[in-house]
């Protein structure tokens, strides 16, 4: 029971985590304009992995995609790659873990196979979570570096005559979503790995013993119980629960607060 709970919880936590990683990757608020030194700006800038947006004084928000690949910073490309790898691994992990769930019966799948699939999905979730955390952390580091660089030369202009306040960027909501989501996926993966240990059938090394009765030759082969599966060869009168696996496609891509027009 504890194994089933651990596996189920691991799956749910990972599912939430991966949904969060997808949401974070799609969000536009990876970096937002720092308003600390300029709280009265009527134009608010924020940027994502795929496009940059400007909210204007009338409330209109204009977003423009990065229509170049080669012109983008290598770090941004690396973050994109890490997040996509995280999503792909997580999605595969989810697919594998659905079939590995103890509460779902698929044919005559052995517990050892379920254990292996649970471990595989767990490792995938761990790597997926690490990819997301790494991606978000690389981006955050990039922001911190750029923030202090732009602070060093806060005002640029022609011989100090024209004051042009350089736009500084700070952490956006997507970073926090990404960190939390990555952490959840990681925790979910660890839980799956723990559940795998409880799922693995204990090997019993009894030899098959033949008892010769007069006139009859009956062989008894004691062969260890399946580890608390409830699914032996005799499934008569046993309810098989098909968990009705649903795909969680409806991850809400964060609507930019002002994208309405």
């Amino acid at each position: 029971m504890a194994v089933t709970a651990c596996q189920g919880l691991g799956f749910v936590v990972s599912l939430i985590g991966i949904a969060g990683i997808i949401a974070a990757t799609c969000m536009d608020q990876w970096s937002t304009q720092d308003l600390y030194n300029n709280p009265v700006t009527a134009v608010f800038n924020y940027q994502g992995l795929w496009r940059s947006c400007v909210r204007e004084s009338s409330g209109f928000t204009e977003c423009r995609g990065y229509f170049t690949l080669l012109g983008l910073p290598a770090m941004l490309q690396a973050v994109r790659a890490l997040m996509i790898v995280g999503i792909v691994l997580g999605a595969i992990g989810l697919l594998v873990s659905i079939f590995a769930l103890k509460c779902i019966r698929i044919g005559s799948m052995e517990d050892s196979a379920k254990a292996n699939m649970t471990l595989t999905s767990g490792i995938m979730f761990i790597v997926s979570g690490l990819c997301a955390i790494a991606g978000v952390s690389v981006f955050a580091n990039m922001l911190v570096t750029n923030f202090w660089m732009s602070t060093a030369n806060m005002y640029t202009g022609m011989g100090g005559m024209v004051q042009t306040v350089q736009t500084r960027y700070t952490f956006g909501a997507a970073l926090f979503v990404g960190w939390v989501a990555g952490g959840l996926t990681l925790i979910g993966g660890v839980m799956m790995c723990i559940a795998c240990r409880g799922l693995a059938p204990e090997e019993t090394n009894y030899k098959a013993v033949s008892y010769h009765a007069s006139g009859h030759s009956v062989a008894y082969k004691p062969g260890g119980f399946k580890a608390s599966t409830g699914f032996g060869s005799n499934t008569k009168n046993k309810k098989i629960y098909d968990g009705g696996a649903r795909t969680e496609d409806e991850v809400q891509s964060y609507p930019s607060k002002h994208d309405y027009v």
Epitope: Q33, A42, N45, V54, T167, V261
Partner: antibody, heavy 115, light 113 residues
Framework: DVQLQESGPGLVKPSQSLSLSCSVT?????????WTWFRQFPGNKLEWMGY???????NYNPSLKNRISITRDTSKNQFFLKLNSVTTEDTATYYC????????WGQGTLVTVSA | DIVMTQSPSSLTVTTGEKVTMSCKSS????????????LTWYQQKPGQPPKLLVY???TRESGVPARFTGSGSGTVFTLTISSVQAEDLAVYYC?????????FGAGTRLELK
């Protein structure tokens, strides 16, 4: 087509409150944009007063901050301006406006503050 | 607050003439996020509300005749009317659209000789 129309009393006594409404047709005030009030003084000087956002948040001109309030009635698709403790200095034509770069303005309503 | 200074305060012109009016802001209205200058020009005729002419310092609003041209960057901007028509006689305002509170210039009045 989007249209804005201001309405309210044309004469207000000093120290009283000035209340104006702006009716919007052709667009829902909850769908987007900041719904803004401007005023133009007799000498033609234009002043931005403040706005109510499509999500209900406000931003006001600091020079009016403790006197101004902009609210809305989403069911009637209207937004309102309330200016407290008016003086003769508040005599102006009041405009409501919205959309990108304030492309749409109401026709304006002249409010005279006089005893 | 950002101070917008317009010059001249009035211009007396004849139809067909080229007209240039200036607007200076006390701080740069350039936004590095999208590389745009948040300076807007409005035209106001007597008894009418202001009408949007040019935004982002140089982008004409749809329906505005091509004779109206905005230019400039940072803190210095100009509005040029290549060939003034009788219907262009109005007051022209520049507006800081980058900082709250949004502020307007005092206006340039275009009058017929």
């Amino acid at each position: 087509d989007v249209q804005l129309q201001e309405s309210g009393p044309g004469l207000v006594k000093p120290s009283q409150s000035l209340s104006l409404s702006c009716s919007v047709t052709g667009y829902s005030i909850t769908s987007g944009y900041f719904w803004t009030w401007f005023r133009q003084f007799p000498g033609n000087k234009l002043e931005w007063m403040g706005y109510i956002s499509y999500d209900g948040s406000n931003n006001y001109n600091p020079s009016l901050k403790n006197r101004i309030s902009i609210t809305r009635d989403t069911s009637k698709n209207q937004f309102f301006l309330k200016l407290n403790s008016v003086t003769t200095e508040d005599t102006a034509t009041y405009y409501c406006a919205s959309f990108r770069f304030f492309a749409y303005w109401g026709q304006g309503t002249l409010v005279t503050v006089s005893a | 607050d950002i101070v917008m200074t317009q010059s001249p305060s009035s211009l007396t012109v004849t139809t067909g003439e080229k007209v240039t009016m200036s607007c200076k802001s006390s701080q740069s209205v350039f936004n590095s996020g999208n590389q745009k200058n948040y300076l807007t020009w409005y035209q106001q005729k007597p008894g009418q509300p202001p009408k949007l002419l040019v935004y982002w310092a140089s982008t004409r609003e749809s329906g505005v005749p091509a004779r109206f041209t905005g230019s400039g960057s940072g803190t210095v901007f100009t509005l040029t009317i290549s060939s003034v028509q009788a219907e262009d006689l109005a007051v022209y305002y520049c507006q800081n659209d980058y900082y709250f509170p949004l502020t307007f210039g005092a206006g340039t009045r275009l009058e017929l000789k």
